[in-house]
């Protein structure tokens, strides 16, 4: 399956926090989305291949890495002034 953690996260002002996303589905592509209250999903970053990733529609204030096929952590940086949202990780073949 695909596992995202933590379930809830509180960030102090000026802090970077990292959300974990791990999958054992042998999927090449992985995605991070953000959903604000009453809105649809918006793509932050996606990766189709190890070590490579592309910006989505709202990449500002976020960073990612894809060091292994199974893992695609998302860092919400201190530059992200409005981080409060629901974050969703996904993967596909």
């Amino acid at each position: 399956g695909i596992t995202q953690s933590p379930k809830y996260l509180f960030r102090k002002e000026g802090q970077n926090v990292t959300l974990s996303c791990e999958q054992n589905l042998n999927h090449d592509a992985m995605y991070w989305y953000r959903q604000d209250p009453g809105q649809g999903l918006r793509l932050i970053y996606y990766s189709q291949i190890v070590n490579d990733f592309q910006k989505g529609d709202i990449a500002e204030g976020y960073s990612v890495s894809r060091e292994k096929k199974e893992s695609f952590p998302l860092t919400v940086t201190s530059a992200q002034k409005n981080p409060t949202a629901f974050y969703l990780c996904a993967s596909s073949i």
């Epitope: 042998n26 090449d28 592509a29 189709q48 291949i49 190890v50 070590n51 490579d52 960073s63 990612v64 890495s65 060091e67 292994k68 096929k69 860092t75």
Partner: antibody
Framework: EVQLQESGPDLKKPGETVKISCKAS????????MNWVKQAPGKGLKWMGY????????TYADDFKGRFAFSLETSANTAYLQINNLRNDDTATYFC???????????WGQGTSVTVSS | DIVMTQSPLSLPVSLGDQASISCRSS???????????LEWYLQKPGQSPELLIY???NRFSGVPDRFSGSGSGTDFTLKISRVEAEDLGVYYC?????????FGGGTKLEIK
């Protein structure tokens, strides 16, 4: 066992075209990108660029924009380097190298020697 | 482009000695995710390069523990604690943090 098998040595004349192949085995080809590295005789290593084996998108270092083209044949697990309008200073050994976990080139082909001479 | 400068150019050693190779980048190679993608490769005579160290200090599988990498920011070092005959060749540092990725000029480890 991961292996990258490159095509054999080639002798070309200036102005001709060469196409080098790099056949991957022992892993899922589209999971890891492929780098190409040039080594002129008696010289150091020079990174030429990178091929995303999932999307087919290539990234080239400035010195290798124009006459150089990376391509792939996913069904054959093979990456290619084509050099057009060959010049004498293209004489070199060309290596393919997998862009493995943690951003490192973890497996390398044996190298293909290209000699350009009139 | 980021320039990687290695020193020394040539390093004569006796078998069993410690060897140290320096690599300096023209600017920081810390990526936005906080990681530093600095590798060390060894090219033995007549062979393809092989990966020794990734992300500054991590040994690749099968690499003996006499090899160690260290450093941060712009200054990096590869140390070989006890040089063996099979260690001879040209060592290259390489940064893959930023495009274009770049190699150092190489350091030739040879017998004194």
């Amino acid at each position: 066992e991961v292996q990258l098998q490159e095509s054999g040595p080639d002798l070309k004349k200036p102005g001709e075209t060469v196409k080098i192949s790099c056949k991957a085995s022992g892993y899922t080809f589209t999971t890891y990108g492929m780098n190409w590295v040039k080594q002129a005789p008696g010289k150091g290593l020079k990174w030429m660029g990178y091929l995303n084996t999932y999307s087919g998108v290539s990234t080239y270092a400035d010195d290798f924009k124009g006459r150089f083209a990376f391509s792939l044949e996913t069904s054959a697990n093979t990456a290619y380097l084509q050099i057009n309008n060959l010049r004498n200073d293209d004489t070199a050994t060309y290596f393919c190298a997998r862009w493995g976990n943690y951003g490192a080139m973890d497996y390398w082909g044996q190298g293909t020697s290209v000699t350009v001479s009139s | 482009d980021i320039v990687m400068t290695q020193s020394p150019l040539s390093l004569p050693v006796s078998l069993g000695d410690q060897a140290s190779i320096s690599c300096r980048s023209s600017q920081s190679i810390v990526r936005s995710n906080g990681f530093t993608y600095l590798e060390w490769y060894l090219q033995k005579p007549g062979q393809s390069p092989e990966l020794l160290i990734y992300k500054v200090s991590n040994r690749f599988s099968g690499v003996p523990d006499r090899f160690s990498g260290s450093g941060s920011g712009t200054d990096f070092t590869l140390k070989i604690s006890r040089v063996e005959a099979e260690d001879l060749g040209v060592y290259y540092c390489f940064q893959s943090s930023h495009v274009p990725r770049t190699f150092g000029g190489g350091t030739k480890l040879e017998i004194k």
